[in-house]
Structure formats: C-alpha cells, structure tokens
C-alpha cells in the first residue's frame, strides 16, 4: 500500500455512476476481487496482490452482512462488517462506524453490475483526516474477460488513478474457495 503523504484526491461523486434499479437480493453471495484500484493501492515490483473473496448476505433490515476472507500470516483471515443502506438503492454506509478508531466517514456505491458475472464498486472513506478511495472489480468467478478488465482500467483512470494504482490480484489456492 502507498504510504506516502501525497494521496491522489478522491473524485467528486458526480464522476461515479450508480447502478440504476439496484437489486439488493441479486447482489448477495460470493464475489471474487478480480481487480483493485485506489489511491492507497500500489503495484509492487515483486509479488502481486493476492485475490480475496467478499460475501454479501442480506439481513432482514436490508443491511448487508459483509465478510471478506483473505490469506494473511499463513492462515485465513475473516473481516466482517455491516453495510447500511444509504440515500439511494446501491449506496451504503458503514454500520457502527464509531467502533473503527479514526474513521469518520465511509461510503459504498455500486457503480455497475449484472449480478451473475461482474460488478464494479466504489468505496470512499475518511480515516485519520485523510481521504481514501478505491474501486473493486468483482467477479462471480476468478477470471473475467479482457474487455471487462479494460473497462475497469478505463473507469479507474477516469477517476484520476494512474496505471500503477490499478492491480489485478492473482488467484490463490488458499482460503478463497472455502
């Protein structure tokens, strides 16, 4: 991750589309993180970013229980949080934000999805008074077409991110297929 003090500024939300007529029930289930871009994401010269999976489960109150599973320190690490519906369908905020030290705002916006194959999701947060943003390219499978990946690159660049802030995590044998 980028540890320098100069973060690329977050784009105005007017540059970030919202999936029209978002269907929260269809978005449920496992998504693989096939692409990842952001102002704190940086392509390394050595090993690539490892793929992780995120599972969205709809609760009765229409919030999502969101669980990410990743390989860390030689074991599977589970990161659980709640996404609470925001102002419009397909937009969310982080539940119980006060329990995250230094975090003052957190926005999730589903940019586009066809539910059964791919999705692009925009995240923006303010932590320790610094504004971070990222875009994930989700896939229901670990591989997506070159066309979808190139569209993700174009969109990420349109938000001000250069190529070295856009990565495609490598699928791994551990954790993500559980």
């Amino acid at each position: 991750q980028d540890s320098t003090s100069d973060l690329i500024p977050a784009p105005p939300l007017s540059k970030v589309p919202l999936q029209q007529n978002f269907q929260d029930n269809q978005f449920q289930g496992k998504w693989y993180v096939v692409g990842l871009a952001g102002n704190a994401i940086l392509r390394e010269d050595k090993d690539p970013q490892k793929m992780y999976a995120t599972i969205y489960e709809l609760k009765e109150d229409k919030s999502y229980n969101v669980t990410s599973v990743l390989f860390r320190k030689k074991k599977c690490d589970y990161w659980i949080r709640t996404f609470v519906p925001g102002c419009q369908p397909g937009e969310f905020t982080l539940g119980n934000i006060k329990s995250y030290p230094g975090l003052t705002s957190y926005l999730v916006r589903v940019v586009s999805t066809n539910y059964n194959q791919h999705a692009m999701v925009f995240f923006k947060k303010v932590s320790q008074n610094r504004e971070y943003f990222k875009i994930t390219l989700y896939g229901r499978t670990k591989e997506l077409t070159s066309e979808l990946k190139e569209n993700f690159i174009r969109f990420s660049k349109s938000l001000g991110l250069p190529e070295n802030h856009i990565v495609f995590p490598v699928p791994i044998d551990q954790c993500i297929d559980g």
Partner: antibody, heavy 119, light 107 residues
Framework: EVKLQESGPGLVAPSQSLSITCTIS????????IHWLRQPPGKDLEWLVV???????TSNSALKSRLSISKDNSKSQVFFKMSGLQTDDTAIYYC?????????????WGPGTSVTVSS | DIVLTQTTSSLSVSLGDRVTINCRAS??????LNWYQEKPDGTVKLLIY???RLHSGVPSRFSGSGSGTDYSLTITNLEQEDIATYFC?????????FGGGTKLEIK
C-alpha cells in the same frame, strides 16, 4: 548475484513421486515468489505452480491434485513434489523467480534438472 | 487454456540484421505478454515484460510491441550473442502459458 539451482533424482519409476529442491541465493524468499515449470521433450514449456513470498500458492488447475509445494525461508529452499508420475512427465523441470507483480514475468531461472520417468 | 503460437520455429539470420519474431494468442491477452531468451547452454533470461517494457540490463536493441492477440519481438542490429531461442509467455489468464519458441540460426 541472484542464483537458482534445482536438484532432483534424475530417474523416477512410474507411479512414484518426484521431489525437487530449488536452492536460491542473492534474494529472500519472503519477498519473491518461486515458480515451477517443465519442458517435456519436443513440447512447449508448461507452468506448474508458484509459491508466493507470503507462503500462499497458485497452481495449474489441470495438475493441482498431483502437486505439492512448500519452502523454508531461512534455508533459502523451495520444495516441489509431484505424485503419480507417468512417462509423459519426463521433462526438464525449472524453478524461476517471479517479477513485476501482476504482469507475471519470471526474471531469473535455474538451469533446470532433467527427470526421466521409466521403469 | 490460452494457446500462444510462434509460427516460425526457426529463422536464418545474419549478424547486423533486424529480426522480428511473432507470437499470436488464441484470445485477447491485454498486453500481458512477456519475452524470454534461451541460450544454447540452456540459460533462460527475461527480456521484455508487459509487451514492450525492457527488463533491467537488457540491451536497447531489443524491443516489443503488439496488442490484443498479436505481439512481436524485434532485435535491431543482431549480434552474435543474440543467437538463441526466443519464446513468449502470457500472464493474463491462468494457467500462464508459453509459445513454442523461435530459434535463430546463422545463415
């Protein structure tokens, strides 16, 4: 100076397992992934598996059930094992260092070790 | 699996030539194409990654180009030490695959 060196048995009987060690120098296994590849006589190179700096692995799904890979960072060694060998597993086996993140290139290669499967 | 085809398996060349070696992928690989050199003694070296980026220490007479499914490696002003086999590799889609190689031979 970066170096990789494979050491293998040379000859393996059919249905037996193959074990090869890749010993590296000039860099750390905690920072770089190590790939295993092979080239059967008269055929293209075939990528088999990689073990990443953090110990996670990525395998060729066609061979995944037969492959095992591990490493000892402190000894600078990577261990490759393949089970159920048949004659068409006869090949030169290479280890190589991963480079350039998700561009998935391999910048340094060992000289290879020849493996013949025969009774 | 993505198939990489190097249609020319051997090429007769003269020192000083400009040599182009081609590699065609069975589907779009979005520039995730790397080139390697294998010397007669079996030593393998990375030359170019991501279609056109020169690996450190590689002479500037080597260059790469291409997009989509068609890629090429060019050596300008061929030198004796360049007599070797050259092969391509795609890093776009698992499993990562290799071309069959193009061997340069002196006329």
């Amino acid at each position: 100076e970066v170096k990789l060196q494979e050491s293998g048995p040379g000859l393996v009987a059919p249905s037996q397992s193959l074990s090869i060690t890749c010993t590296i120098s000039g860099f750390s296994l905690t920072s770089y992934g190590i790939h295993w590849l092979r080239q059967p006589p008269g055929k293209d190179l075939e990528w088999l598996v990689v073990i990443w700096g953090d110990g996670s692995t990525t395998s060729n799904s066609a061979l995944k059930s037969r492959l095992s890979i591990s490493k000892d960072n402190s000894k600078s060694q990577v261990f490759f094992k393949m089970s159920g060998l048949q004659t068409d597993d006869t090949a030169i086996y290479y280890c190589a260092r991963h480079r350039y993140s998700d561009y998935h290139a391999m910048d340094y290669w060992g000289p290879g070790t020849s493996v013949t499967v025969s009774s | 699996d993505i198939v990489l085809t190097q249609t020319t398996s051997s090429l007769s060349v003269s020192l000083g030539d400009r040599v182009t070696i081609n590699c065609r992928a069975s589907q779009d690989i979005s520039n995730y194409l790397n080139w390697y050199q294998e010397k007669p003694d079996g030593t393998v070296k990375l030359l170019i990654y991501f279609t056109s980026r020169l690996h450190s220490g590689v002479p500037s007479r080597f260059s790469g180009s291409g997009s989509g499914t068609d890629y090429s490696l060019t050596i300008t002003n061929l030198e004796q030490e360049d007599i070797a086999t050259y092969f391509c590799q795609q890093g776009n889609t698992l499993p990562w695959t290799f071309g069959g190689g193009t061997k340069l031979e002196i006329k």
